[in-house]
Interface confidence: low
């Protein structure tokens, strides 16, 4: 549960109080800096007197609730917290076309962590107008493009002033194709390897699969300087090579310098293009494998080696890169790459114009259609210090609640706000205070964040000679006496020199002089005992160890233990504490408890005879929900199956819906149509009754696979 | 390449402001942070600021009250403007291009700056 | 702000022999400590980012290595041309600082 804290700037700033009952349990420690290091869920409690005569003093260690269970008062109880303070909070604003806009708020808190202790912040992310572009033209190099080459010489600058009208940050590379240098798709006559083109006279370069020229930059001359130093080559054939280049550049992305921003492919070309098993064709066996191969002058250097891809490993590939992109092609081939455009997603085809001008407007409308992703990354952390996120995207697809190292929101619009849960947790003390960087991969701005560590307990300077301790036999801090040399006791009321008298053993026996001092479980000083670790009584005869576990763990964590017996916290019962009184697991979804086919104990469902499932809402020898419903979906959904002519009446209950989400996981029922044909659905109780989510499956397509 | 230039008088009055451009040719000002650096006489060198690709600025506490640094991306130029200047403002300016890692990559030949009346 | 101290202040060297020049930092700077050569009526040239990344153009006698607090600037081999000033600057936490500089001179 959230709580809003008051920092001392003065400003809000939300936090998580820790489940205390998580990971263990509070165990005895001598003292209160030990205490409190060593689990998150210690307190200690530094009230005088509050351990009994020969009570180790280590038992002022312990759970919170233990210790006010024990008579301890809460203003004595010593629990530092990790706290927050946010130093500065500029509010989200969208600035000028990107410029000077604040999209990540907060910009400076200061962390203090309580080892063990997750301290949870929220940190939002606006995406303003002005998100960055990456884009990597690509270009189709054989002769029949000696025309074009000349117009893409020009297009940098123009790429640059279009999309700095949307954005601030613009990089622009670009790669040049023109097909595998082996028989047929390119001569190899020496004289033709060497200078394909027909003119003895023109610049030409010899024929290559790809390069890769220039890597992503912002420098519009750049990309006219090295567009300037290409030569259009020659091939054989009519359809290209450019699969084998648009996979390169999605998978080499260290080469070609892809940032995490919105990337743009430009695909220019006349002509179409080989696939996989056109390698065959020229010796060539080896399926492409998915991987890089540019040389360090950014060549391709395997294309003899492997086939070209096929279309779904392109799209995988370019999916997987989040790359969108843009087939500028010639008006003859149009129609293919239309059709290509179906199987690749997020992609757009355009008709390519004499001027270019208008590979420049397909640009600027793929831009604005692009679905971003917004991730939030981090600097490196201290040692001991760990980091997840916690993803709140407000979109289609929202990651709500999902942990990671990183946060990461898809599709983010313009002037959409989303939000990251940043939980940081330390497990041990920092040395010094750490600066961590959290910032949106590919935007400028950072949230700082201080971290420090809280690992000393605050219970004021030791009082020298204290009166408490045997009229200043020894020294007080935070509760107990750290004794003068040759002086013993919990407050210092021994002298090492009486230690061995046998009268004072006595004191540490039963009263019948029978068995070991203080029940073996402590130490007989100065006629008391001082008893270890979880024991305690006048004699050690009680341990506070010996309760009943539930999953490993004493009074399951929500009790404590005294002399053998859980005592548990108000909404729990059982001889381990292990029976929870809510009954929030039992509730069907309908209302009830399990199903009115069980009753609730410990918060699960008990069923009865018959029925089964955590909510005793499947029963033996019924139909599954996909059976029961199967009809009513193809029916509802299709038209068509056994309950056609009357579906209205039959299943007069059952809202039918068309979905088309993406992930079928194992709630979904398939099933086939009456002309067998492969569909899914989801079973919903919703308040209004049955609600069935049908997905029509595409034909030739199993997504089972 | 990237290309930096610093212009601006070599000589300023004490207590007036001090103003420098920095002229980038070969990389669009709205890419990358840019900053501004100076060398005293002694050797000693001290960042004084930037502005970054979205316009926003960070500044030397020890400066902040008297420097401001602003750009014109139409010109592809920056600005530093430093007031209320004493002779210990005397020092070589240099503009660089930098980055949130701090490092300068590329610096102009930096401007010799004196404060004298 | 963070204090960057570099030593010795000069150091006389002979030509070919190998040399470490020493930056501390008053707190952690994990790696983000920038090394920079100086010759005289010169702007500064960048040697080393990030403690030990050469970077492109700059001879390979040139190294780094350190982290947190302690750093040390490597010339492995020198040669006339590098008696100059070398600069650390650290780039973790704003304002970015210099040292003071280690000017090599020659024996």
């Known amino acids: 549960e959230l709580d809003t804290k008051i920092t001392s700037s003065g400003e809000a700033a939300e936090w998580e109080d820790p489940d205390l009952s998580l990971q263990g349990s509070c165990q005895p420690v001598p003292s209160c800096q030990k205490c409190i290091l060593s689990h998150p869920s210690c307190a200690w409690c530094k009230q005088l007197n509050f351990t009994a005569s020969g009570e180790a003093e280590a038992r002022r260690c312990a759970r919170r609730e233990e210790l006010l269970a024990r008579g301890c008062p809460a203003q004595e109880l010593e629990e530092p917290r990790g706290r927050q303070e946010v130093l500065q909070d500029k509010p989200l604003s969208q600035g000028d076309r990107g410029e000077g806009a604040t999209q990540l708020a907060p910009q400076r808190i200061r962390v203090t962590l309580r080892p063990g202790e997750p301290q949870k912040f929220r940190v939002r992310f606006l995406r303003a107008a002005g998100y960055p572009v990456d884009l990597y033209y690509l270009m189709d190099l054989s002769y029949s493009m000696k025309d074009d080459l000349e117009r893409v010489r020009q297009l940098g600058h123009a790429l640059l002033v279009r999309l700095q009208e949307v954005t601030h940050s613009v990089r622009i590379g670009f790669g040049s194709f023109v097909d595998k240098t082996v028989l047929p798709f390119v001569s190899t006559v020496p004289s033709k390897l060497h200078h394909p083109c027909p003119s003895r006279l023109e610049r030409c370069q010899p024929p290559f699969s790809f390069h890769h020229v220039l890597s992503l930059t912002g420098d519009a001359q750049a990309f006219e300087r090295e567009v300037g130093r290409q030569n259009v080559s020659g091939n054989l054939d009519s359809p290209e090579g450019g699969f084998d280049a648009i996979l390169q550049a999605a998978l080499c992305q260290e080469q070609i310098g892809w940032r995490n921003v919105s990337r743009l492919l430009v695909f220019t070309s006349d002509d179409t293009f080989h696939t996989a098993g056109d390698g065959k064709l020229g010796g060539i066996f080896m399926p492409s494998d998915g991987r890089c191969h540019l040389d360090s002058n950014g060549v391709y250097t395997n294309s003899a080696e492997f086939d070209y891809p096929s279309v779904g490993q392109v799209a995988q590939a370019l999916t997987a890169a989040n790359i969108q992109p843009i087939f500028a092609v010639t008006g003859a081939t149009l129609p293919v790459y239309q059709e290509l455009r179906q199987l690749i997603p997020k992609s757009a085809v355009g008709e390519l114009s004499e001027d270019s001008s208008n590979v420049v407007q397909l640009i600027m409308d793929a831009y604005d259609s692009l679905s971003s992703t917004v991730t939030l990354e981090h600097s490196p952390l201290p040692p001991g210090v760990s980091i997840s996120f916690e993803s709140h995207c407000k979109g289609p697809e929202k990651t709500e609640g999902e942990a990671g190292d990183r946060g990461q929101c898809n599709d983010v619009r313009v002037n959409q706000t989303v939000d990251f849960w940043v939980t940081l947790q330390a497990t041990h003390c920092l040395p010094e205070a750490h600066v961590l960087r959290l910032w949106a991969l590919g935007f400028s701005e950072e949230l700082t964040v201080e971290l420090h560590t809280v690992c000393d307990c605050n219970c004021g300077d030791a009082q020298p000679h204290a009166p408490y301790c045997s009229d200043g036999q020894g020294d007080l801090q935070c509760g107990i006496c750290s004794c003068a040399p040759g002086r013993l006791g919990q407050l210092c009321e021994c002298s090492e020199a009486d230690l061995s008298s046998p009268d004072l053993e006595s004191g540490c026996r039963a009263p019948n002089g029978t068995g070991p001092l203080c029940s073996g479980k402590g130490r007989c000083q100065c006629g008391r005992c001082s008893c270890s670790g979880q024991s305690s009584g006048r004699l050690c005869e009680c341990d506070d160890a010996s309760c009943e576990r539930h999953e490993g763990i004493l009074c399951g964590g929500f009790g404590h233990c005294q002399c053998g017996v859980c005592h548990c916290h108000a909404n729990h019962t059982g001889r381990a504490c292990e029976c929870s009184k809510s009954v929030d697991s039992c509730v069907s979804p309908e209302g009830g408890l399990c199903s009115g086919h069980g009753y609730c104990k410990c918060n699960r469902c008990q069923c009865l005879d018959g029925y089964y499932g955590a909510l005793c809402d499947q029963c033996l020898g019924c139909k599954s929900p996909c059976e029961q419903y199967r009809d009513c979906a193809e029916c509802g959904a299709f038209g068509t199956g056994p309950l056609a002519a009357n579906c209205s009446v039959v299943c007069a209950d059952v809202n039918v819906t068309l979905t088309l989400a993406p992930n079928l996981d194992d709630g979904w029922c398939k099933e086939r149509t009456i002309d067998n044909q492969l569909f899914f659905f989801l079973v919903e109780h919703a308040a209004s009754g049955i609600v069935l989510r049908v997905r029509p499956q595409e034909k030739g397509v199993d997504h089972t696979r | 390449e990237v290309q930096l230039q610093e212009s601006g008088p070599g000589l300023v009055k004490p207590s007036q402001s001090l103003s420098l451009t920095c002229s980038v040719t070969?990389?669009?000002?709205?890419?990358?942070?840019w900053g501004w650096i100076r060398k005293f006489p002694g050797n000693k060198m001290e960042w004084m600021g930037y502005?970054?690709?979205?316009?926003?600025?960070s500044y030397n506490p020890s400066l902040k009250s008297r420097i401001s640094i602003t750009r014109d991306t139409s010109k592809n130029q920056f600005f530093l403007q430093l007031n209320s200047v004493t002779t210990e403002d005397t020092a070589t300016y240099y503009c660089?291009?930098?980055?949130?890692?701090?490092?300068?990559?590329?610096w102009g030949p930096g401007t010799m700056v004196t404060v004298s009346s | 702000d963070v204090v960057m101290t570099q030593s010795p202040a000069t150091l006389s060297v002979t030509p070919g022999e190998r040399i470490s020049l020493s930056c501390r930092a008053s707190?952690?700077?994990?790696?983000?400590l920038h090394w920079y050569q100086q010759k005289p009526n010169e702007s500064p040239r960048l040697l080393i980012k990030?403690?030990?990344q050469s970077i492109s153009g700059i001879p390979s006698r040139f190294s780094g290595s350190g982290s947190g607090t302690d750093f040390t600037l490597s010339i492995n081999g020198v040669e006339l041309e590098d008696l100059s000033i070398y600069y650390c600057?650290?780039?973790?936490?704003?304002?970015?600082?210099f040292g003071a500089g280690t000017k090599l001179e020659l024996k």
């Open positions: 990030y403690a030990s």
């Open positions: 707190e952690s700077v994990d790696t983000y």
């Open positions: 502005i970054s690709y979205s316009g926003s600025t």
């Open positions: 660089a291009m930098t980055g949130s890692s701090g490092y300068f990559d590329f």
């Open positions: 070969g990389f669009f000002i709205t890419n990358n942070y």
């Open positions: 600057q650290q780039g973790n936490s704003l304002p970015n600082t």
